[in-house]
């Protein structure tokens, strides 16, 4: 099975005990790490940090001591722009441009691949989306030729039924990427002015239209219908929680919230929560099961958090392996406990490790 | 071997403009931001411009600002720096550098810029 | 910006000692500090980048400590070669800045 994981390069900013470099990740625990972002400008890719170069080097050195290990540049992400990534993809010479561009400067930089974030095509990207990728995936074929190790090609897609329906050919791109990364968590935010999970793995048993299909289940089950091969699948999981701020005295699913949760004392994102973060939540706090979503979340106060622990990424693995997917990925690592001092397992990584073992278990 | 020469530099007086080249070799241009440093006689190192591989992002030191360009030319494998309204205080060994992230990690061998009347 | 602040300006050392600069930036810079070599009418050579990671071919004497604010380049056993000039530089935010620099002399 793979287990694919993401690194963000903007972890390295987070103060004290929160700040990630790309050399405090354990070599071993993935089988492809992705860096999380790169830039377009000029039609060409580029880095979108400074310092991203240095972190290139600290990244792809985990290679030298396991050298089955694949890494993977994304190019793309929320700041990016959905915009800026249609111009380029509806324009002949800009994606020509853009294409030619990659395959020198990951070789340059010591990359296995390239990892598609355009987060996301609009209604009338669909076609330039699948174009862009069957380009790509051609490109790496030609530029192998000299017997290179081809580049990889994936993508990061969403797991929302109408994103997916908007935005994707599903059967299409899935004939020339290597692997699809479904990103199946963020289903439930504070838009929705109630409590609930953001990765659930089953329907709730309140869940009506549309609420029906926000959830890992629904998404995978689509994708499969819509022409994705199992082979390729690979099931997001989160090392990170949904907080909301309650605004009763409710505390469970479906309860009143007034907004997003506080801020975390390292992530500083009102609404979400690291791994490591939550750690320090639970000390004091009230843990209850979704019993049908396999899923936990915690309450403090008027706070309430759904995440994902141990307990639930074995379920998760458990689903795909019966789905017969690809494996797992993770956003992110630097969410994760990754200096095994917050969650008092004495463990680094404890989540993406729980997920190596049930990948591993037979 | 990566390789880096400088040329343009000379006596100019306040006021005046020169353009520096550098001429790149032995890695991929392309893929790597670039900067210059200066080094006033006698003095310490300062950092002057950067711009992007793709040169799509360039920054400036103050003192620079709004009287250098930096920019490249990709297909030359060419680093340049337009000095413009150049005073007396820019007088200095330029050097050209490859960054490695935000560090420098080959310099060219430098060339004095002197700019007096 | 950024001030990056070296001591001591100068020191006097022997073949075989240890010696340590340290470079304390006026605000914190994470692991973005970076250090320099100079001799005299030569270009600057990398040592140590990210504070702590030893540029290729840089001997393993030289190594580099720190995070924060506070950073430390230590030479654990001094050579005749390394005599010269060193400046601390962070690549935290622009603009990037050089400390005032170290000079390393022959006692």
């Known amino acids: 099975y793979k287990l694919v994981c993401y690194y963000t390069s903007w972890s390295q900013y987070r103060e004290g005990d929160g700040s990630c470099f790309p050399d405090a990740l354990d070599r071993f625990l993935c089988t492809h790490i992705i860096y999380s972002f790169a830039n377009i400008s000029n039609d060409h890719i580029d880095t979108w940090e400074w310092n991203d170069v240095t972190l290139y080097g600290m990244l792809n050195t985990l290679k030298n001591r396991n050298p089955n290990l694949k890494t993977l540049l994304s190019v793309g992400g929320w700041n990016f722009g959905s915009q800026r990534f249609s111009k380029i993809a509806s324009n002949t010479q800009s994606r020509r441009t853009f294409i030619k561009s990659v395959p020198p400067f990951l070789r340059t930089h010591g990359f296995d691949g390239l990892d598609l974030a355009w987060l996301y095509p609009g209604r009338r990207d669909k076609q330039h989306f699948t174009t862009l990728i069957k380009e790509m995936k051609a490109e790496f074929i030609k530029e192998a030729q000299p017997g290179k190790k081809q580049l990889l090609l994936s993508a990061a897609l969403s797991a929302g039924k109408v994103t997916i329906d908007s935005s994707y050919d599903i059967a299409k791109i899935s004939q020339h990427l290597d692997f699809i990364s479904i990103m199946t968590y963020d289903f439930h935010g504070a838009w929705r002015g109630t409590t609930g999970h953001h990765s659930p793995l089953f329907r709730g048993q309140e869940d009506a239209s549309p609420d029906r299909f926000s959830n890992t289940d629904y998404a995978v089950g689509y994708m499969l219908r819509l022409g994705a091969p199992a082979s390729k699948l690979v099931m997001g999981i989160p090392t990170f929680g949904r907080s909301f701020t309650l605004a009763s005295s409710e505390t469970g699913v479906g309860a009143p919230i007034s907004g997003p949760g506080i801020p975390g004392r390292f992530t500083k994102e009102a609404g979400t929560l690291a791994y490591y973060e939550i750690c320090d939540f639970l000390r004091g706090a009230t843990v209850h099961r979704i019993l049908g979503q396999q899923v936990p979340y915690a309450t403090k106060g008027n706070q309430w958090v759904g995440y994902d622990d141990q307990e639930s990424v074995k379920s998760k693995v458990q689903y795909l392996k019966d789905r017969q997917l690809a494996g797992a990925m993770v956003w992110a690592l630097d969410l994760d406990d990754f200096q095994g001092s917050f969650c008092g397992q004495d463990l680094r990584f404890p989540l993406t490790n729980a997920i190596k073992d049930a990948l591993a278990a037979t | 071997e990566v390789q880096l020469v400088e040329s343009g530099g000379g006596l100019v007086q306040p006021g005046g403009s020169l353009r520096l080249s550098c001429a790149a070799s032995g890695f991929t241009f392309s893929s790597y931001a670039m900067s210059w440093v200066r080094q006033a006689p006698g003095k310490g190192l300062e950092w002057v411009s950067a711009i992007s591989g793709s040169s799509g992002s360039t920054y400036y030191a103050d003192s620079v600002k709004g009287r250098f360009t930096i920019s490249r030319d990709n297909s030359k494998n060419t680093l340049y720096l337009q000095m413009n309204s150049l005073r007396a205080e820019d007088t200095a060994v330029y050097y050209c550098?490859?960054?490695?992230?935000?560090?420098?990690?080959?310099w060219g061998q430098g060339t004095l810029v002197t700019v007096s009347s | 910006d950024i001030q990056m602040t070296q001591s001591p300006s100068s020191l006097s050392a022997s073949v075989g000692d240890r010696v340590t600069i340290t470079c304390r930036a006026s605000?914190?810079?994470?692991?973005?500090l970076n250090w320099y070599q100079q001799k005299p009418g030569k270009a600057p050579k990398l040592l140590i980048y990210a504070a702590s990671r030893l540029q290729s071919g840089v001997p393993s004497r030289f190594s580099g400590s720190g995070s924060g604010t506070d950073f430390t380049l230590t030479i654990s056993s001094l050579q005749p070669e390394d005599f010269a000039t060193y400046y601390c530089q962070q690549s935290y935010s622009t603009p990037w800045t050089f400390g005032q620099g170290t000079k390393v002399e022959i006692k």
């Open positions: 550098a490859k960054a490695q992230g935000t560090s420098a990690d080959f």
């Open positions: 605000q914190s810079i994470s692991r973005w």
